[in-house]
């Protein structure tokens, strides 16, 4: 922690500029005002101070807003906002896209997942929706930021902006992401034809229930063995050989290669195996013929 | 991560000069260029020259017109040349420098001593 002291006379300070870069910390803790500092922010970045140094300049902004900075400071941080915990981020209030992208182009790249996370989310509650030109800006941005929001903040999403969201885009996303995503996408896509559809769905697929991965089965849309491995086990179980076979096309003879994998190992055990060889992929594993499969859960349920 | 290293102090007599050089082991990737910093015992540490990635140089009052910074990019070097020097100047001399992911650099030092 830097020790108070009191500034000598010749280190006043009356503009944050360049010298500052040559005051030891004592001196910029002791000597620059909080409130000129807030006042003057967009100077700060533009001054080759050390991290050390801005340290500094962070603990006096701390004091000066212990319930959170002000968006005009927010904007201007710059290198400091590297310096900054999902703790202080979370005491912000964000509305400017402006800031936002600012912010993110300073942490692209580096070890910041936590707090851009946290920043996300302060703009969506700031902007009270996910709307168009916060998704065209992360996705410009922070391509897979998306996937850093909550499911509850990315339910604000309107089914409208999803055409703006890029394959790439949900790469991180996980299952409850996806969950909430899909019947977006669902329904923002809903007036295509078969092929386009497929093409504009097939990312937010990870969300699909049974029933909606039964249906692509009838259309003809071969789809791809990464695509597949993505989809919910528990929308995947359900599915026939017969329905695999049409959901895959000629990329069925993929499935041997994943044949160890989820939720490719987990179908194959479901499956009678006289269907499976069916296929002719040598997969292994499912049900001997003869055996009687008797679903417990449903006497339990009824009991 | 770069490491860095100087060598070039020494004790020397009021009014003489030094020249310390900082070698780094690789290309770095500076948000602010490098600094020649230094501490006295029992004080903080303090920058006394800096050069910025563009070239521009920047010195400290108290060594105005007695120390020169410069950059040997092809040794991957930064050197601070110092003459005039007082015994006010006596401290451990660090180089160093700031990346662009929230971190700052030093060497290990290397003592300057002016005393007659």
């Known amino acids: 922690d830097v020790e108070r002291t009191t500034c000598p006379p010749e280190k006043e300070v009356h503009e944050i500029d360049e010298s500052l870069i040559f005051y030891k910390k004592r001196e910029l803790e002791a000597c620059v005002d909080a409130a000129l500092l807030a006042a003057q922010m967009d100077r700060v970045d533009a001054i080759p101070f050390t991290y050390e140094q801005l340290d500094v300049l962070k603990h006096k902004l701390d004091e000066l807003y212990p319930q959170g900075y002000p968006e005009s400071v927010i904007r201007h941080l710059g290198h400091l906002f590297l310096k900054m915990s999902p703790e202080d981020i979370r005491k912000w209030n964000v509305t400017s896209l402006e800031t936002l992208k600012a912010l993110l182009k300073v942490s692209k790249g580096h070890e910041m997942s936590a707090q851009v996370a946290t920043l996300i989310d302060r703009v969506v509650v700031g902007r009270g929706q996910l709307d168009k030109d916060t998704v065209d800006t992360l996705t410009a941005f922070c391509p897979g930021c998306l996937c850093s929001l909550s499911p509850e903040r990315l339910s604000s999403v309107p089914p409208s902006v999803i055409g703006a969201v890029r394959p790439q885009d949900l790469d991180t996303c996980g299952p409850r992401q996806l969950d909430v995503l899909y019947p977006k996408a669902r329904l923002a896509f809903q007036n295509m034809s078969g092929s386009e559809y497929f093409v504009k769905i097939r990312p937010f697929l990870g969300g699909a229930p049974t029933e909606d991965v039964k249906a692509l089965s009838q259309q003809n849309v071969s789809m791809d063995l990464a695509t597949f491995m993505k989809l919910r086990r528990e929308a995947v179980l359900p599915l026939t050989v017969a329905e695999v076979q049409k959901l895959l096309g000629p990329h069925v003879e993929g499935l041997k290669v994943e044949e160890q994998h989820s939720p490719v190992r987990d179908w194959i055990l479901k499956q009678r195996q006289d269907d499976l060889d069916t296929l002719g992929l040598g997969l292994q594993g499912g049900i001997p013929n003869g055996y009687l499969i008797l679903d417990l859960s449903v006497r339990e349920a009824l009991s | 991560q770069v490491q860095l290293q100087e060598s070039g102090g020494g004790l020397v007599q009021p009014g003489g000069s030094l020249r310390l050089s900082c070698a780094t082991s690789?290309?770095?990737?500076?948000?602010?260029?490098m600094g020649w910093f230094r501490q006295a015992p029992g004080e903080q540490r303090e920058l006394v020259a800096r050069i910025l990635n563009d070239g521009t140089t920047m010195y400290a009052d108290s060594v105005k017109g007695r120390f020169t910074i410069s950059r040997d990019n092809a040794k991957n070097t930064v050197l601070l040349q110092m003459n005039s020097l007082k015994p006010e100047d006596t401290a451990v001399y660090y180089c160093g420098y700031s990346d662009y992911r929230g971190t700052d650099y030093w060497g290990q030092g290397t003592q300057v001593t002016v005393s007659s």
């Open positions: 690789g290309t770095i990737f500076s948000r602010n260029g």
